[in-house]
Interface confidence: low
C-alpha cells in the first residue's frame, strides 16, 4: 500500500519555510505532489517539494557549507594573518632600531662621517628589509657596497685627513683598494655570514606565514561539487519535502556526507602537519646567528669594532693606498697628521632600558604553541563542521538522508545512496585544481623549511674560529655577544628587549629615513575575529 | 616627519553617505596599520577598525561592522573610510590614527554634521 | 569587549600639585596601556605606551604605571598647560578601547 500523504498534507509548513529562502511562493506545491521529476530528494509518496525548489536547497546548502567551512578557520586564519602583519611589523622595526643604532654609534664615535654614514647605513638597512620582504637582492653585495661606500669616507676624513680637494678623484680606487687590501680585516666577512643567514630564516619564515595564509584562504573559498551539493541538500533539505520540519540528520550520517564533500580537502592534512611541524624546527634554530634581532641589532657593535681595525692599522695603509692609488692623485700626497682622539675608546651605546623580557624569539615559540593546537585543522574538519550544524545527538530519532529512522545505520543509509550517486566515487574524484596547487605549494614551503632548519653541527660556528674570531668567547647561557674582534667585544645585556614597539610604531628616526616596503597582498579580511592574548605580546 | 591630513568638515543628509579621507606622508603608507576613531561628546572615543595598506586588510569593532568601510590608496598614500545610511548617531568627530596599538600620529579629525 | 573604566570624570589640582589618574580595566591587558592628553579643538595626543614608557617629547612629569588590570597616569608637578582632558586605552586585543576620559582642571 502507498505510504501515508505527509503529516503537514497542505505543505503549509514548507511553504513558509521556502518563502525565508526564496520570496515568493510559485514553486511550493500548496498540497503534496507526486514528485516524478526529482532528482535529488527522491520520494517514496507525495512530496511538497519540486524540481526548482530542490534547486535551491542545492544552492542554499552549498552556501551554507562555506560558511561553515569559513567559520570553522575564522581562527586559525586570524591568528596567522595577525602574526603576519606583526612580525612583518616586528621585523621592519628591528631594522629600524639597528639602523638608529648604527647612525648613533656613527654619530658618537665618528661625527666626521655621519652626513656620507648616515646615506650608506640607510641605503644598506632598505635593503635589508626589501631582502625580509623577498626582493631579489644578493646579501654580500649589500655588504660590499656598505663598505665599499664607507672606505672612501673613512680614508678622506680620519686616515688622511690632510688629503687635498684636487685628490678626491681617488674614490673608485679606494673601493678596489678596500677588497684587495682587506682594509677591515675579517669584519666585513663576519657581517656577511651572520647577514646572510639570518635574513634567509627570516625571509623564509614570513614566507611560511604568508603561505599558511594562502592555504586557508583557498581552502575558504572552496567551491563545492555539484555531488555534494545532492548529498548536503539530501541531508539538510529533503526531510522538509516530507514536511518533517523539526527533525536532524543523524550524527553518523553528517560525517560520512561530510567526508564525501571534503576528501580533496582533507588531503592538504598530511601536508600541513608537515608545514607545522618544518615551521616548529626553523623557529628552533633561530637564535644567535640565525636570529636577526640578535644580528642586527649588534651590526653597529662590529662596525664600530671594523672601523678601528682600519685605524689600527691606518699608518701602513695609508702608505700602501698612497702608492696604490697616486696616479689617481695630481700628486702623491700624504698626510703624517693623525687626529689625537683617532683610537676612540668605544663607547657601549646605552640601550633603552626595557622591564619586560618579551622578545620576538618567545613571540614566535607562542606563535608556534598555537599553532600546533591546529595541527589536526585539515583531517577534523568534517567532525567539525558536523558539531557545528544542527545534528540529532545519540543518532536516535534522526534523518537519514531518505527517512526519519530511530537508530542510524551507516550500511543502510550507503544502500540507499547507491541509487543516487556514488560515495565512493565521489571521494575518488582527487582534489580540486586549486586543492592541489596549494598542496604543490605546501610541498615547496616545507622542503624549503626543512633545508633551513638551522643548527645541526654549528658549522657555521667553527668557520668564524678559523677566521680568527674568539666565538668561543659566548657560551649559550652567557649574555649574547654580539660581533667583536678578540680584544674589544661589546657585549649588551640580555641582547635587547624592545619588543615593546612591536607593532606598535612609535619612531625615534631622528637620521635620514630609509623607506621600506610592505607585500601586498589582495586578500581583504573584513571580520575581526577578537584575538585576546594573540595580539599582545606582553601577557 | 609624520603627517595625516584630514578634511575639516563634511555635511551630510540623514540616509546618505560619506567617504572621508586621510593623506599620510613623512613615512611609508603601506608599512604601518591605519586606525579610525569616532569621537562624540556623549561616547566618548571609539575605535572604529583599521586597515593595513601593505595588504589591505582589514579590521573592525563589530559595532561599526556595516556602518564604516575602510580602504587604501596606496598610489596617493591616502587612507579612506566610507559611512553608510547615516543619522544623527554619526554626527561626530572622526580621526585617523597611526601605529599598531598606541596611536603615535593622529590626524586633525573630520568633523561630519548629519542634518536634513 | 574590554571595558576601561576612568573613575574620576573631573579631578581638580592646583599649580605644582601632584595629580593621579586611574583607569581600571575589565580584565587583564598585561601592560598593553596608552594615555593620551586631548585639550579642546585638538586631536588626542600620546603620553605613555606599555604603560610606563614616555613618547617622544613629553615632560617628564607625566609618569604611568600599573599592569594586569589597575593603571595610574601620574602628573607631578602640574602645570598650567596640563589642563585637558586625559584617556586611557587598551590595546591588548580587538577591538581596541578607551576610557571615557578624566578632565583636569587648574583650580
Known amino acids: 500500500q502507498p505510504p501515508p500523504p505527509p503529516p503537514d498534507a497542505t505543505c503549509h509548513q514548507v511553504r513558509s519555510f521556502f518563502q525565508r529562502l526564496q520570496p515568493g511562493l510559485k514553486w511550493v506545491p500548496e498540497t503534496p505532489v507526486p514528485g516524478s521529476d526529482l532528482q535529488v530528494c527522491l520520494p517514496k509518496g507525495p512530496t511538497c517539494c519540486s524540481r526548482k525548489m530542490e534547486e535551491k536547497y542545492q544552492l542554499t546548502a552549498r552556501l551554507n557549507m562555506e560558511q561553515l567551512l569559513q567559520s570553522a578557520s575564522m581562527e586559525l586564519k586570524f591568528l596567522i594573518i595577525q602574526n603576519a602583519a606583526v612580525f612583518q611589523e616586528a621585523f621592519e622595526i628591528v631594522v629600524r632600531h639597528a639602523k638608529n643604532y648604527t647612525n648613533a654609534m656613527f654619530k658618537n664615535n665618528y661625527p666626521s662621517l655621519t652626513p656620507q654614514a648616515f646615506e650608506f647605513v640607510g641605503e644598506f638597512f632598505t635593503d635589508v628589509s626589501l631582502y625580509i620582504l623577498g626582493s631579489d637582492i644578493n646579501v654580500d653585495d649589500m655588504v660590499n657596497e656598505l663598505f665599499d661606500s664607507l672606505f672612501p669616507v673613512i680614508y678622506t676624513q680620519l686616515m688622511n685627513p690632510g688629503l687635498p680637494d684636487s685628490a678626491l678623484d681617488i674614490n673608485e680606487c679606494l673601493r678596489g683598494a678596500r677588497r684587495d687590501l682587506k682594509v677591515f680585516g675579517n669584519f666585513p666577512k663576519l657581517i656577511m655570514t651572520q647577514v646572510s643567514k639570518s635574513l634567509q630564516v627570516t625571509r623564509i619564515f614570513l614566507q611560511a606565514l604568508n603561505l599558511g595564509i594562502e592555504v586557508i584562504n583557498t581552502t575558504d573559498h572552496l567551491k563545492f561539487s555539484k555531488d555534494c551539493g545532492r548529498m548536503l541538500t539530501r541531508m539538510w533539505y529533503c526531510s522538509y519535502c516530507q514536511g518533517l520540519m523539526m527533525v536532524k540528520p543523524c550524527g553518523g550520517y553528517c560525517n560520512v556526507v561530510m567526508q564525501g564533500c571534503m576528501a580533496g580537502v582533507v588531503e592538504i592534512d598530511k601536508y600541513w602537519r608537515e608545514y607545522i611541524l618544518s615551521l616548529e624546527e626553523l623557529v628552533n634554530g633561530m637564535y644567535r646567528i640565525y636570529d636577526m634581532e640578535n644580528v642586527l641589532l649588534g651590526l653597529f657593535s662590529t662596525i664600530h669594532d671594523s672601523i678601528q681595525y682600519v685605524q689600527k692599522n691606518a699608518g701602513k695603509l695609508t702608505t700602501t693606498i698612497g702608492k696604490l692609488c697616486a696616479h689617481s692623485q695630481q700628486r702623491q700626497y700624504r698626510s703624517a697628521y693623525y687626529p689625537e682622539d683617532l683610537f676612540i675608546d668605544k663607547k657601549v651605546l646605552k640601550v633603552a632600558h626595557v622591564e619586560h623580557e618579551e622578545t620576538l624569539s618567545s613571540r614566535r615559540r607562542e606563535l608556534i604553541q598555537k599553532l600546533k593546537s591546529f595541527i589536526s585543522f585539515y583531517s577534523a574538519l568534517p567532525g567539525y563542521i558536523c558539531s557545528h550544524s544542527p545534528v540529532a545527538e545519540n543518532d536516535t530519532l534522526c534523518w537519514n538522508g531518505q527517512e526519519l529512522v530511530e537508530r542510524y545505520s551507516q550500511k543502510a543509509a550507503r544502500n540507499g545512496m547507491k541509487n543516487q550517486f556514488n560515495l565512493h566515487e565521489l571521494k575518488m574524484k582527487g582534489p580540486e585544481p586549486v586543492v592541489s596547487q596549494i598542496i604543490d605549494k605546501l610541498k615547496h614551503i616545507n622542503q624549503l623549511l626543512r633545508t633551513m632548519s638551522m643548527p645541526k653541527g654549528r658549522v657555521l660556528d667553527k668557520n668564524l674560529d678559523e677566521e680568527g674570531f674568539e666565538s668561543g668567547d659566548c657560551g649559550d647561557d652567557e649574555d649574547e655577544c654580539i660581533g667583536g674582534s678578540g680584544d674589544g667585544m661589546i657585549k649588551v645585556k640580555n641582547q635587547l628587549r624592545f619588543l615593546a614597539e612591536l607593532a606598535y610604531d612609535l619612531d625615534v628616526d631622528d637620521a635620514p629615513g630609509n623607506s621600506q616596503q610592505a607585500t601586498p597582498k589582495d586578500n581583504e579580511i573584513s571580520t575581526f575575529h577578537n584575538l585576546g592574548n594573540v595580539h599582545s605580546p606582553l601577557k | 616627519q609624520v603627517q595625516l591630513q584630514q578634511p575639516g568638515a563634511e555635511l551630510v543628509k540623514p540616509g546618505a553617505s560619506v567617504k572621508m579621507s586621510c593623506k599620510a606622508s613623512?613615512?611609508?603608507?603601506?608599512?604601518?596599520?591605519m586606525h579610525w576613531v569616532k569621537q562624540t561628546p556623549g561616547q566618548g572615543l571609539e575605535w572604529i577598525g583599521a586597515?593595513?595598506?601593505?595588504?589591505?586588510?582589514?579590521s573592525y569593532n563589530q559595532k561599526f561592522k556595516g556602518k564604516a568601510t575602510l580602504t587604501a590608496d596606496k598610489s596617493s598614500s591616502t587612507a579612506y573610510m566610507q559611512l553608510s545610511s547615516l543619522t544623527s548617531e554619526d554626527s561626530a568627530v572622526y580621526y585617523c590614527?597611526?601605529?599598531?596599538?598606541?596611536?603615535?600620529?593622529w590626524g586633525q579629525g573630520t568633523l561630519v554634521t548629519v542634518s536634513a | 569587549d574590554i571595558v576601561m573604566t576612568q573613575s574620576h570624570k573631573f579631578m581638580s589640582t592646583s599649580v605644582g600639585d601632584r595629580v593621579s589618574i586611574t583607569c581600571k580595566a575589565s580584565q587583564d591587558v598585561g601592560t598593553a596601556v596608552a594615555w593620551y592628553q586631548q585639550k579642546p579643538g585638538q586631536s588626542p595626543k600620546l603620553l605613555i605606551y606599555?604603560?610606563?614608557t614616555r613618547h617622544t617629547g613629553v615632560p617628564d612629569r607625566f609618569t604611568g604605571s600599573g599592569s594586569g588590570t589597575d593603571f595610574t597616569l601620574t602628573i607631578s608637578n602640574v602645570q598650567s598647560e596640563d589642563l585637558a582632558d586625559y584617556f586611557c586605552q587598551q590595546y591588548s586585543s580587538y577591538p581596541f578601547t578607551f576610557g571615557s576620559g578624566t578632565k583636569l582642571e587648574i583650580k
Open positions: 586597515i593595513y595598506p601593505g595588504n589591505g586588510y582589514t
Open positions: 590614527a597611526r601605529g599598531g596599538g598606541p596611536f603615535a600620529y
Open positions: 613623512g613615512y611609508t603608507f603601506t608599512s604601518y596599520n
Open positions: 606599555w604603560p610606563s
